[in-house]
């Protein structure tokens, strides 16, 4: 059962796992949600009736029954983790805490103009978990405007105290706002020889990398595969750090793999969701339950639905016994990972999918595409929407992309002459325009947010957000696309597609079926040569064949240039402008979305 509200002046008795410090009960709830075992918590607020050393304590708790006895206590605030809830969860915390000093290891001290600048510094520093900033009113002259970057083993403060004229806050890495590089490569036959901060068991290097990503201190990792010579180290995932933030030594070793934390790209790739099955693999751990199940998929469902289950092993049925049902062992451990991994015993293992909701919805795998052909199939581009105007008559106006459950990203030039959002209708999950009838459900538009530097498509800033009147329920036919990571600026995308219902030639009409075309990206230097009369800025991205023939055209505007990278689709461009359509040596020009990630997040996350 999902309980989101906080219980004031209430304390849960017993079940303690650990105590951390958090600046608010709300953040305590987030910490509890991300902890592998925490189901309930009790937070102590500042209060004259409480011992100041207990202020801001967040006691993480567990219970076999998923609840604990309640006791009345002034200043105590209790609640449940969001593990029991189905809604999307985020660790992003933009709150600034006034007159609080969050204690940790002060590893960097510098002057900053504002708390915001200090927070940005923390977000772009690989080690920083949180910061404290002394304002210009701080009593001690030499400490005024000082920005202290801090880290701890747990990622949360070691203590929190009241201190006048300072403010504290957390790194915004988990809000996708870091400019740090996003290095997704996994290096085979490589060991990083730096200090280990922790070690866990993992079935493969990908899971190891994802564990490193959501471990507060891990910057990179080394994984020993099941073929590693030393038996005791097989399937061992070593979580590592270094002072520089990079591995100091790389050693060539067969059967080992190494890689980096994906912290800077975690909003656009799954880091909590381990969805694979591991055949002929047994996960060991504390047994929670043994249930009969028809298949390993059914076993995974059972684990996902049991809130305390973290991983499972399924042993298929022997011949015809037990109605063809096998045994499903639901398991847990102190850190969420198996205590040991064994091979060759016939089991099929995997993880709960309960944590998938902590990942961005946009990372969910979608239907495999149909290669070749220009007409799309249903569910192939589930983020693509058709934006209709009702003026003078109802018609397709522009394309757009779902980037959040209330947000569509599109082009600013689509709204020339549109005086009110009320006259617009957004249709999602559409393949053919002919499906849209008078009674077809649509999303009304609450607000049109056009970039304030936009003047005309050719001069850039051709980007706009539509805030919908109601939220989109994600399904196979309507779901978001990931924004590119700022850390991915140097990625070379090779699998890019433009989609839309636009014209197929310059003098044509809107197409009935959603069209698709695979188009190569063109460097900005090359693109500039093709458009001598225009300035192709770094905020634009170009795509097209030298010989022409495939391109976006009228009616495709605002739609996505979608590129697949590491099995995840990213919204790399927004169809903006071009000279004619599909002309030789005239690539299409798109808004370069990565350059607007801050703007998008600022607008969509505004309170």
């Amino acid at each position: 059962e999902c309980v989101t509200q906080l219980l004031k002046d209430t304390c849960f008795e017993g079940g303690d796992i650990t105590t951390v410090f958090t600046p608010s009960a709300k953040y305590c709830q987030v910490v509890c949600t991300y902890h592998p075992r925490c189901l309930l918590f009790t937070f102590t607020a500042e209060s004259p009736s409480e011992d100041p050393t207990r202020w801001f304590t967040c006691v993480l708790k567990d219970s076999v029954t998923e609840t604990l006895p309640r006791v009345n206590r002034t200043a105590a605030i209790s609640g449940y983790s969001f593990k029991q809830c189905s809604h999307q969860i985020s660790a992003c915390n933009k709150d600034i805490y006034v007159d609080l000093d969050m204690k940790g290891i002060n590893y960097n001290s510098s002057v900053a103009k504002s708390a915001q600048e200090c927070q940005e510094r923390c977000t772009d520093d690989v080690h920083c978990h949180f910061f404290t900033y002394a304002t210009r009113q701080f009593p001690s002259l030499e400490h005024r405007n000082i920005c202290l970057l801090k880290h701890t083993q747990t990622g949360t403060p070691t203590r929190i105290t009241k201190l006048d004229k300072v403010v504290s806050g957390f790194s915004l890495k988990s809000c996708a706002l870091s400019n740090l590089a996003c290095i997704r490569d996994i290096f085979p036959n490589t060991v990083f020889a730096d200090s280990n901060i922790d070690s866990v068991m993992a079935p493969d290097a990908f899971v190891c990398g994802r564990i490193c990503t959501h471990h507060p201190g891990c910057l990179f990792f080394t994984f020993f595969s099941q073929e590693w010579p030393k038996e005791s180290q097989r399937n061992l995932c070593l979580l590592k750090t270094s002072e520089s933030g990079l591995p100091s030594t790389r050693i060539k070793k067969s059967k080992a793999l190494s890689g980096f934390s994906l912290q800077s790209c975690r909003h656009s790739i799954p880091v909590f969701c381990h969805s694979s099955f591991y055949h002929d693999t047994d996960f060991l751990g504390e047994e929670l339950d043994i249930v009969a199940a028809k298949s390993h998929e059914a076993c995974q469902k059972l684990c996902t639905n049991a809130v305390r289950c973290q991983f499972f092993t399924y042993t298929p049925a022997q011949a015809s016994c037990n109605e063809g049902k096998g045994k499903c062992y639901l398991k847990l451990s102190s850190n969420g990972s198996p205590t040991k991994i064994l091979h060759g015993r016939g089991g099929i293992s995997g993880y709960t999918l309960r944590l998938c909701k902590m990942d961005n919805e946009c990372t969910t795998k979608i239907k495999p595409r149909i290669v070749g052909g220009t007409a799309s199939v249903r569910g192939e581009w589930p983020w693509q929407v058709t934006l209709h105007t009702t003026s003078p008559t109802q018609r397709h106006l522009c394309g757009g992309s779902i980037i959040g459950n209330q947000w569509i990203l599109t082009a600013a030039h689509c709204f020339y002459g549109v005086e009110s959002p009320k006259i617009l209708r957004v249709y999602s999950g559409i393949l053919n325009q002919s499906e849209i009838k008078e009674d077809t459900s649509f999303f009304g538009v609450q607000e049109i947010i056009i970039h304030d530097q936009y003047k005309m498509a050719e001069s850039g800033y051709d980007i706009a957000l539509l805030k919908l009147e109601t939220t989109v329920n994600y399904t196979d036919s309507q779901r978001p696309i990931c924004l590119p990571s700022k850390g991915d600026r140097n990625v070379i995308y090779t699998d890019c597609w433009v989609t839309g219902w636009g014209y197929r030639k310059l003098r044509d009409k809107i197409q009935n079926t959603l069209q698709k075309a695979k188009i190569p990206l063109v460097t900005n230097e090359e693109c500039q040569k093709r458009y001598r009369g225009h300035k192709i800025t770094h905020k634009m991205i170009c795509a097209g064949y030298r010989e022409g023939g495939k391109d976006a055209c009228k009616g495709d505007s605002g739609g996505p240039l979608s590129c697949k990278h590491n099995e995840v689709w990213h919204l790399v461009g927004i169809t903006s402008w071009g000279e004619g359509c599909a002309q030789r040596e005239r690539p299409g020009v798109y808004t370069n979305v990565v350059e607007y990630v801050d703007w998008i997040l600022e607008k969509t996350q505004a309170v």
Epitope: P392, T393, Q394, S420, K422
Partner: antibody, heavy 117, light 107 residues
Framework: QVQLVQSGSELKKPGASVKLSCKAS????????MHWVKQAPGQGLEWIGN????????NYDEKFRTRATLTADTSTSTAYMELSSLRSEDTAVYYC??????????WGQGTTVTVSS | NIVMTQSPSSLSASVGDRVTITCKAS??????VSWFQQKPGQAPKLLIY???NRYTGVPDRFTGSGSATDFTLTISSLQAEDVADYHC?????????FGQGTKLEIK
Amino acid sequence: QVQLVQSGSELKKPGASVKLSCKASGYTFTRYWMHWVKQAPGQGLEWIGNIYPDSDSTNYDEKFRTRATLTADTSTSTAYMELSSLRSEDTAVYYCTRMGFYAMDYWGQGTTVTVSS
Amino acid sequence: NIVMTQSPSSLSASVGDRVTITCKASENVVTYVSWFQQKPGQAPKLLIYGASNRYTGVPDRFTGSGSATDFTLTISSLQAEDVADYHCGQSYSYPLTFGQGTKLEIK
């Protein structure tokens, strides 16, 4: 069922103003554009303008922009057209019509306006 | 402004005849053309929308065709009750405009 009921005939002197009404029922008034069309005796149809009741967005033909004012009262689902500085050539039947999904699908019965001294 | 030129301005035909009325737009209006029927003393009624889609309840002897600039309304077999004025109109762009109308009579 969708119905548009217009106000009764009007006899006006040149220079005067007239305000015609069009009461809508049977559909969500705020979600459809309401258009006004003029038909002079023995002539074709002439578009005056339209209004979107949910936002009061309006469009006018240049010819009528200075003299026609379109308004809507969402509480009573009624659209209005006021025509000022009347002259003899304004003598006509005025229709309100709903712009449906793709076309003007429902029309009022029309209001006859006669401008005569 | 887009000018819609309708022809003929009047025509007389016998019951059972095939009747064609044309409408020419001064610029491309894609398929944003509607046809209306107006009987004496009545308001216009929608017959065809989107150049070729028959509106609900309209007999299938009425057919619309065309795109871009040239549009046609065809009555495959004229009936006595089809005596009326017929108007074409474009809703591609503001200001919306209509043809001058065609008066259809029975011989």
